[in-house]
């Protein structure tokens, strides 16, 4: 266990041209406050994913009113450190988000208004117990200067706060095999109480006989690297050689979420969905009001009307959750019609439409035939985002530009001879057959299977196909 500490040194305009306008004015005095969110590991995580290592809010800074005509100076800051307690081992690598918020103190209906001024994020390696690390981050035209460190809470020591220390029993030296606890030379490393064989690098314990694994390691002694591949069951097969998570108690067993929070398993651990008025990794932080700035991602906080609705976050488009902490997968609603591709750009949705369709949601079927002429008297037929020409007799091809040979397909049956004609084709039938395509046999008694031939045409004459 330990505490991550963040000290904000300054927040103001960054170097270079385009200095930002002061966020406060004589008409709208304001003050700043900060929020820090910590996540274990170096993975690039979205801003709205849970602050699994913890989060903290600063106090409000002094009220600031801009001097007319003066450039935006470094703005007055809240007193004190931001402290994020962590219960388990310090992971050594972590991601952070630091948000600078403005509280407007003008005469708003409904109380003060909050707005996000700047957000910076980074990924760092940091050993617990080390000196303060200094950092400068820029967000647009703003610059944030800060320092941070992680320190262990006694009796924990070490770079991960996993070793335990106890006051010396003898004044001169530590017991056999036990080292002094630097930098606390008057204390000694406590006897090893973890399960025998528990990896000293990848495991730790808080109770005698247990072996809890740092992120990325598994197995009863935390000696097996976690691999997400080749796992067959929801928590992986039981063979420790596969490097999969071993079946056993799930992270939600016993519900680690306090205050009525509901637990859901995640690939790495668990996540608590907290009822209103509670937040934190295990919903352990309570008594939240709008003054604590609980709405993330630019959500607007309003005071609730009863103790179970202590505050309400009205989320901007694209976010949801009681603290606006979840990004809405708006494409899952399949808003793009006619096979359009959905793109969630954060601030807006875009649909990339298939050929032949247009509109914000690809809802308009374009006139496929617009500007598409079919040559030689052909007519255009629309369909499915493409156009097709129905050609006049004697023409073919996509645009009816090719002169067709009507005899190419051998249309005259029973050995009839085909002649191309300006209006189509004519079949000259072999003896014993008649019809436009010579398809009907002439009966031996002279009667045909068709009605009597029209006047002037004897059976056996060439029949013109009209």
């Amino acid at each position: 266990a330990g505490v991550f500490e963040l000290q904000i040194h300054s927040f103001g305009p960054g170097p270079g041209p385009g200095a930002p306008r002061s966020p406060c004015s004589a008409r709208l005095p304001c003050r700043l406050f900060f929020r820090v969110c910590l996540k274990p590991g170096l993975s690039e995580e979205a801003a709205e994913s849970p602050c699994a290592l913890g989060a903290a809010l600063s106090a409000r800074g002094p009220v600031y009113t801009e001097q007319p005509g003066a450039p935006a100076p470094d703005l007055p800051l809240p007193d004190g450190l931001l402290q994020v307690p962590f219960r388990d081992a310090w992971p050594g690598t972590f991601s952070f988000i630091i948000e600078t918020w403005r509280e407007e103190l003008g005469d708003q209906i409904g109380g003060p208004a909050w707005s996000l001024l700047a957000r910076v994020a980074g990924r760092r390696r940091l050993a617990a117990g080390g000196p303060w690390a200094r950092d400068i981050q820029r967000a647009g035209a703003w610059e944030l200067r800060f320092s941070y460190r992680a320190r262990c809470e006694p009796p924990a020591v070490g770079t991960a706060c996993t070793r335990l220390c106890r006051p010396r029993s003898a004044p001169s030296r530590c017991g056999p095999g036990l080292r002094p606890c630097a930098p606390l030379e008057d204390e000694c490393e406590a006897p090893l109480v973890c399960r025998a064989g528990c990896s000293p690098e990848h495991g730790f314990c808080e109770q005698p006989g247990e072996c809890r694994c740092l992120e990325g390691w598994t197995g009863p002694l935390c000696t097996v690297p976690v691999s997400t591949s080749s796992c067959l069951s929801p928590r992986g097969p039981s063979s420790a050689t596969t490097g999969c998570l071993v079946p056993g108690p799930g992270p939600c067993d016993g519900n680690p979420c306090a205050n009525g929070g509901s637990c859901s398993e995640t690939p790495r651990s668990f996540e608590c969905t907290c009822p209103r008025g509670f937040y934190g990794l295990r919903c352990e932080v309570s008594g939240v009001t709008c003054a604590d700035g609980p709405c993330f991602n630019g959500g607007l906080c309003v005071g609730g009307a009863d103790p179970d609705s202590a505050y309400i976050c009205h989320c901007p488009p694209g976010f949801q959750g009681s603290n606006c902490e979840k990004r809405v997968d708006r494409c899952s609603l399949q808003p793009c019609r006619n096979g359009g591709l959905c793109l969630d750009l954060g601030h807006a949705l875009r649909c990339r439409c298939r050929a032949g369709f247009a509109g914000p949601r690809c809802e308009h079927d374009l006139d496929d035939c617009a500007g598409r002429a079919c040559a030689n008297g052909g007519t255009c037929v629309e369909g499915g985002g493409a156009h097709r020409c129905s050609c006049a007799l004697g023409f073919g091809g996509r645009d009816c530009r090719e002169r067709a040979d009507p005899c190419a397909a051998r249309p005259c049956a029973h050995g009839g001879r085909c002649y191309a004609h300006f209006s189509g084709l004519v079949c000259a039938c072999a003896p014993g057959y008649m019809g436009a395509r010579c398809e009907f046999p002439v009966h031996p008694d002279g009667a045909s299977a068709l009605p009597a031939a029209p006047p002037g045409l004897r059976p056996g004459d060439p029949q013109r196909y009209l």
Epitope: G303, P307, D308
Partner: antibody, heavy 117, light 109 residues
Framework: EVQLVETGGGLVQPKGSLKLSCAVS????????MNWVRQAPGKGLEWVAR??????????YYADSVKDRFTISRDDSQSMLYLQMNNLKIEDTAMYYC????????WGQGTLVTVSA | QAVVTQESALTTSPGETVTLTCRSS?????????ANWIQEKPDHLFTGLIG???NRAPGVPARFSGSLIGDKAALTITGAQTEDEAIYFC?????????FGGGTKLTVL
């Protein structure tokens, strides 16, 4: 728009029983605490009972005047709120409202309960 | 049990500003009392006006505002209209119990 529709009121004799229902629509009923409030003829408002959500173990709270006689309950699957009223007294005569507090107060149209000999 | 006290009646004129207050017998009204203001018009027509001290309900005119003034919750009507004539109740939460004031009958002459 949030809608709260109370039913089940009527005329009942002292020491009798009645069960009020409130059908809720247009919001996520399961998330919120729900309340019953009443107004006796010519009088002010009196809070009667409250039931919290599943996350808070459906905890219930009652005004002293109705404790041990009234029972508030809910059916999340049907978005229904109930008030079982036993051992009714003449002073329980009132218009009963299903009330939901969120960013402000949402009221139903009420159902009249008359306790008379 | 806490007692919540309101002015029994107030009279104002159209266009005037009037403030209704809500006092708690247990001491100062704070944000954890989640003061609510409710308007009652004839025929048991109740409308939630303000929640959480200062959160105005949608559709409620901007002339209605809620606040904490000193040790009391307050409802201010800036530029009262004749249609604002009604009974106004304030409700305060004490943990999970709600206590209403007796109501203020507002007359707009």
């Amino acid at each position: 728009e949030v809608q709260l529709v109370e039913t089940g009121g009527g005329l009942v004799q002292p020491k009798g029983s009645l069960k009020l229902s409130c059908a809720v629509s247009a919001f996520t009923f399961t998330t919120y605490a729900m309340n019953w409030v009443r107004q006796a003829p010519g009088k002010g408002l009196e809070w009667v009972a409250r039931i919290r959500n599943k996350s808070n173990n459906y905890a219930t709270y009652y005004a002293d005047s109705v404790k041990d006689r009234f029972t508030i309950s809910r059916d999340d699957s049907q978005s229904m709120l109930y008030l079982q009223m036993n051992n009714l007294k003449i002073e329980d005569t009132a218009m009963y409202y299903c009330v939901f507090y969120y960013d402000y107060v949402y009221w139903g149209q009420g159902t009249l309960v008359t306790v008379s000999a | 049990q806490a007692v919540v006290t309101q002015e029994s009646a107030l009279t104002t004129s159209p266009g005037e500003t009037v403030t209704l207050t809500c006092r708690s017998s247990t001491g100062a009204v704070t944000t954890s009392n989640y003061a609510n203001w409710i308007q009652e018009k004839p025929d048991h027509l109740f409308t939630g006006l303000i929640g959480g001290h200062n959160n105005r309900a949608p559709g409620v005119p901007a002339r209605f505002s809620g606040s904490l003034i000193g040790d009391k919750a307050a409802l201010t009507i800036t530029g009262a209209q004749t249609e604002d004539e009604a009974i106004y109740f304030c409700g305060l939460w004490y943990s999970n119990h709600l206590v209403f004031g007796g109501g203020t009958k507002l007359t707009v002459l």
